[in-house]
Interface confidence: low
């Protein structure tokens, strides 16, 4: 892969992701084979000249070859790069102002792997740009200052690949202070720092902070401050916890809008293509369970054999080819027995009883299901687990200390600094990092080399 390119040759340092030091012909790059190859290789690049912003350029690139072009930036701006490549392609995209980039000399570098659904180069200095790969289209955004910028697409695969790209100027993106030092993501002019970094410009390294410094730690979970979300309060409200929405949706204003057939906060659950099942069934585990008399993927097909018999529960009307059903029977073929209760919107009547969709229970499918463990120490009341004396927690699985003795619970509920679990013989606290003691109430010293 291209990870070998991220390790610079000795003798140069990086500042904000920019390779410094004088370029020279003695620059070398460590190639995948492990050997050193002089940068001044002949016949190893294709130059297509200056590319116009907004116009798509296409080039076939042999393996091990750079395709080079230039873009002239007349005023500082955010530029969105749309790059199309084959599904098995592996490319490195190098961008450098003023001079042609090499494996070792560049201002920005992106790694594009056609096999990956989405890819972000993991080293903090490279994570300044968001990069997504949908099918064969990669998109990333870079802030480019005035000047002539040189692009180089390096084919790190085994085969010739057809590559094309175009660039679009983004007006709405504002610049961030010092480009977040490469330690954060710039969103509308505000730095959202990656874990381990703090400050308006993400310049300060930080010790691990509970709730990322963006929330209050309480009872084992983070209560996020306004504008933040996620288990660690590390995701801005206008972003999605899973930016790819499980590969089954799009992130819009911080919420996943799921593709047909998927649901859930992160589009991680399989849903029916028509969640209503055409009003003739219920959706269970992503499949429509149809009411009698109905069939098809979405219960959209009226299914009857020999309707003139009306399932033995009605009278056939030959003039219209329809059944007039006996009392307590319904449906086009009188095959649906009327339930004694209305199954509502979360169930269908099958054989005189309500069959509930996922997450619902009760004779009329009108009660939300609780976690199966709720019944151990509580009672389920419409999706909420009401705990018996001495128990608490969402599913009534956490015992409470009574009169200073440890009965079936943990000391002081682990003080919110641990998880209460049932060991071999008793309940005990499993403390979070930085806490110890039977009740996780003793803070441990931690040393941070800032």
């Amino acid at each position: 892969g291209l990870n070998w390119q991220l390790q610079p040759a000795d003798g140069h340092t990086f500042n904000n992701g920019i390779r410094t030091g004088l370029p020279g012909n003695d620059d070398v790059a460590t190639m995948p084979s492990g050997g050193k190859v002089p940068w001044s290789l002949k016949n190893s690049s294709i130059d297509s000249g200056e590319a116009e912003v907004g116009r798509r350029v296409t080039q076939e690139v042999p393996p091990g070859v750079f395709w080079r072009s230039q873009i002239h930036i007349s005023q500082p701006q955010f530029l969105k790069f749309n790059i199309s490549l084959g599904k098995d392609a592996l490319f490195g995209v190098y961008i450098r102002r003023g001079l042609p980039p090499s494996h070792a000399q560049y201002d920005f570098m992106e790694r594009l792997d056609g096999k990956e659904k989405w890819s972000v180069v993991e080293s903090p200095r490279e994570r300044r740009s968001i990069q997504t790969l949908v099918q064969n289209e990669a998109v990333f955004v870079q802030y480019l200052d005035v000047g002539l910028w040189h692009l180089a697409f390096y084919n790190d695969g085994k085969d010739k690949e057809m590559v094309s790209f175009n660039t679009v100027v983004l007006d709405s993106v504002q610049d961030c202070p010092r480009n977040c030092h490469g330690n954060g993501e710039c969103v509308s002019g505000v730095c959202h720092c990656f874990p381990g970094f703090l400050g308006a410009d993400c310049a300060k390294a930080a010790c691990p902070v509970l709730c990322s410094g963006n929330g209050q730690y309480s009872k084992g979970t983070c209560q996020c401050y306004s504008g933040w979300k996620g288990a660690e309060c590390d995701v801005p409200m206008n972003q999605c916890i899973d930016p790819s929405c499980g590969g089954h949706g799009s992130c819009i204003d911080g919420n996943c809008v799921c593709s047909a057939g998927y649901k859930g906060e992160h589009c991680e659950e399989v849903d029916c293509l028509d969640p209503t099942c055409s009003s003739h069934g219920v959706c269970v585990n992503g499949e429509c369970l149809c009411s009698p008399g109905w069939g098809g993927l979405n219960c959209e097909l009226a299914r009857v054999q020999c309707p003139d018999q009306c399932s033995g529960h009605g009278t056939y009307l030959p003039d219209t080819g329809l059944c007039s059903c006996d009392p307590n029977w319904m449906g086009p073929d009188c095959s649906v027995e009327v339930c004694s209760v209305d199954c509502g919107t979360h169930g269908v009547c099958i054989g005189g009883a309500c069959r509930c969709e996922e997450g619902w229970t009760g004779a009329a499918c009108d009660q939300r299901v609780c976690h199966p463990r709720c019944i151990e120490h509580g009672t389920c009341k419409d999706g909420k687990c009401e705990c018996r004396e001495g128990w608490n927690g969402e599913h009534c699985t956490i015992g409470r200390q009574t009169a200073g003795t440890e009965t079936d619970g943990c000391p002081d509920l682990c003080n919110g600094n641990g998880r209460c679990t049932l060991g071999q013989n008793s309940w005990q606290c499993v403390c979070q990092t930085g806490w110890r003691g039977p009740g996780c109430n003793v803070a441990m010293e931690t040393s941070c080399a800032d």
Epitope: A302, G314, G321, C334
Partner: antibody, heavy 127, light 108 residues
Framework: QVQLQESGPGLVKPSETLSLTCTVS????????WSWIRQPPGKGLEWIGY???????NYNPSLKSRVTISVDTSKNQFSLKLSSVTAADTAVYYC?????????????????????WGQGTTVTVSS | EIVLTQFPGTLSLSPGESAPLSCRAS???????LVWYQQKPGQAPRLLIY???SRATGIPDRFSVSGSGTDFTLTISRLEPEDFAVYYC?????????FGPGTKVDIK
Amino acid sequence: QVQLQESGPGLVKPSETLSLTCTVSGGSISSYYWSWIRQPPGKGLEWIGYIYYSGNTNYNPSLKSRVTISVDTSKNQFSLKLSSVTAADTAVYYCARDIVVVPAARDYDYYYGMDVWGQGTTVTVSS
Amino acid sequence: EIVLTQFPGTLSLSPGESAPLSCRASQSVSSIDLVWYQQKPGQAPRLLIYGASSRATGIPDRFSVSGSGTDFTLTISRLEPEDFAVYYCQQYGSSPFTFGPGTKVDIK
């Protein structure tokens, strides 16, 4: 012989709710679908939605936020409510029986069609 | 939604002539999901053909339907005076169940 009769006010003020009732006579409302269709002056037909006698509904998405179709099997009636009306809702409103016929000895052929219609009622939206 | 287009908009013919009325769908529709109606001035529409080729009660055999996929034709083989009206196609292939704009058959 099944017959349908629409009833309701012929004049509705803008932003108010249009309410129409369709009375089914000469047969039972059970075991059928019942539809509402409208036709603006000099224009074509627009399907509004249907209700199954058990209460299941299906609405035209373009009107879904404003439309409610309900059924009263005891009165052999079904009704249409269209909220927040504007002049664009001026039309002849028809109720119809929407059959689902599955011919004998054919499992998957399901035939549809509105075989019985009311004579229509004109609704004008104006202040 | 499936958009139905009907053409011609108006067909001027004499009694006894044949009238081909076209209905085109924006996406494929099963022939059994296409329905045809006839509407005369001041009257409600009347079901003509349903289920590919089934004629509704009382509809004479001079009315027939052909076609599949996206292109369908209602043919009135010998126009009678009572056949001059507006004809609508409607699809039940997917909700919403849309109608075509209609074709008016009038006397030349």
